[in-house]
């Protein structure tokens, strides 16, 4: 009996530009002789319902259709057909076929493969055209896919013990696609500081697929209006 | 980090006073105020009141009016919870709490209050 | 003073069951309500804050929601580590007041 196993769950999360190695075991009755055996890798992209072929390994024969691919021969030994992709882009996304014959068997898998870029975020203050007492907090999320962000205002005042979120006064832009392929966002706060307490901690909170914590920016309101002491919390998958 | 440390337990007989510390370390100690809770054995837990930590304001839960006072000793970082006029009902674990961080809000370890006779 | 009320107060599950607990308070608090987890002999955790935002480090499995007078915490496959006691808490004024808990056991 020969089987296939793929990563659980279907899907493969990756960071873009990582070296990526998509899982495939092989599990047979017996011991794997790789002289042979072979081992096929396609995919198939997003965009398109076409299948390609990225790697082919039988017997004596290896070849590499996309470049760097690599299945390692001494691992296949033990039953791991796992493909190695250096240098992952986001438009190589989308489903991955393990294909494995052992004569007269065959046997396959397919994983879907998600490529996602952190965003990197920043803290800006723009007092241009505001009124006294009256300042402008922008937060800037760049470089980040999918697409999909969510950015959110919290404040915690010193009384009480959990933030709380900012719902008046926020305006979110459209998100905006770089020629990489990546996205950037603004989502601005309005603030009028005479209003506030001093010691209030504001943040910019953002939260996106890549990320297994949220992206923090925040900054303090002192007796002397704010210190925009931004500070940065990136977790980002590994 | 962040580290409040309460005193040890106590025991009391109904009628005296106790007073439980709270010992901060780890951040800027008078950014910041702190609540004491009260969770009797096997219930829920109550907020008894706060003060801030540069000692010019309190606030207190109108049920623990006239039975507890806050201070605090600036140069100790440390924050004072006074119970007067114990009675049984008062036999409970008191917690000093401060808001948090990305983490949750922060509080100690407790400090068991016996009230027997 | 806004009021609390917890349910159930206590329940037994399995480890994977999906468990909900459910806070209702007195009159509207927004979404300024958090959850905590207490273990016995120790100080409680926080695991929600604003209703439905978890804390860094709190596992996926946990979620809140609810606005208004309404409010539930999920967990949505039980792990051993969180059988434990979960409490409520308003925090839109003072007093602060919490739940009287809900006892999560072991079946």
């Known amino acids: 009996d020969l089987k296939v196993e793929m990563m659980a769950g279907g899907t493969q999360i990756t960071p873009l530009n990582d070296n990526v190695t998509i899982f495939c075991n092989i599990f047979y009755s017996q011991p794997l002789n790789i002289t042979s055996m072979g081992i096929t890798w396609f995919w198939k992209s997003l965009t398109f319902d076409k299948e390609v072929k990225v790697f082919e390994f039988f017997g004596d024969h290896q070849e590499a259709f996309r470049p760097g691919a690599i299945v390692s021969p001494w691992r296949l030994k033990s039953g791991d057909a796992s493909l190695r992709l250096p240098g992952i882009q986001l438009e190589e996304a989308g489903e991955y076929r393990c294909e494995v014959v052992v004569t007269p068997l065959k046997a396959q898998g397919t994983v879907q493969l998600e490529v996602v870029a952190s965003p990197a975020s920043r803290l800006l203050l723009d007092q241009v055209g505001m009124k006294e007492n009256e300042d402008k907090y922008m937060c800037e999320s760049s470089g980040f896919y999918p697409e999909a962000i969510n950015i959110t205002w919290e404040k915690q005042t010193q009384k009480f013990p959990h933030p709380i979120e900012i719902s008046e006064d926020v305006i979110t832009g459209p998100t905006i696609k770089n020629m990489d392929g990546t996205f950037n966002v603004t989502s601005c706060l309005k603030l009028n500081s005479s209003q506030e307490d001093p010691g209030t901690v504001y943040q910019c909170v953002v939260r996106h697929a890549s990320l297994h914590t949220p992206l923090r920016s925040n900054f303090t309101l002192t007796a002397a209006r704010h210190s925009l002491s931004e500070t940065e919390k990136t977790d980002n998958f590994s | 980090q962040v580290q409040l440390v309460q005193s040890g337990a106590e025991v009391k007989k109904p009628g005296a006073s106790v007073k439980v510390s709270c010992k901060a370390s780890?951040?800027?100690?008078?950014?910041?105020?702190m609540n004491w809770m009260k969770q009797a054995p096997g219930q829920g837990l109550e907020w008894i009141g706060g003060?801030?930590?540069?000692?010019?304001?309190?606030d207190y839960n109108e049920k623990f009016k006239g039975k507890v006072t806050m201070t605090v000793d600036t140069s100790t970082s440390t924050v004072y919870m006074e119970l007067s006029s114990l009675r049984s009902e008062d036999t409970a674990v008191y917690y000093c709490?401060?808001?948090?961080?990305?983490?949750?809000?922060?509080w100690g370890q407790g400090t068991l209050v016996t009230v027997s006779s | 003073d806004i009021q609390m009320t917890q349910s159930p107060s206590s329940l037994s599950a399995s480890v994977g069951d999906r468990v909900t607990i459910t806070c209702k308070a007195s009159q509207n608090v927004g979404k300024y309500v958090a959850w905590y987890q207490q273990k016995p002999g120790k100080a409680p955790k926080s695991l929600i804050y604003?209703?439905?935002n978890r804390y860094d480090g709190v596992p996926s499995r946990f979620s809140g929601s609810g606005s208004g007078t309404d409010f539930t915490l999920t967990i949505s496959s039980l792990q051993p580590e969180d059988f434990a006691t979960y409490f409520c808490q308003q925090y839109i004024s003072y007093p602060l007041t919490f739940g009287a808990g809900t006892k999560l056991e072991i079946k």
């Open positions: 780890g951040y800027t100690f008078t950014n910041y105020w």
């Open positions: 003060i801030y930590l540069n000692g010019d304001s309190t």
């Open positions: 604003s209703a439905s």
């Open positions: 709490t401060r808001r948090g961080d990305y983490f949750g809000d922060f």
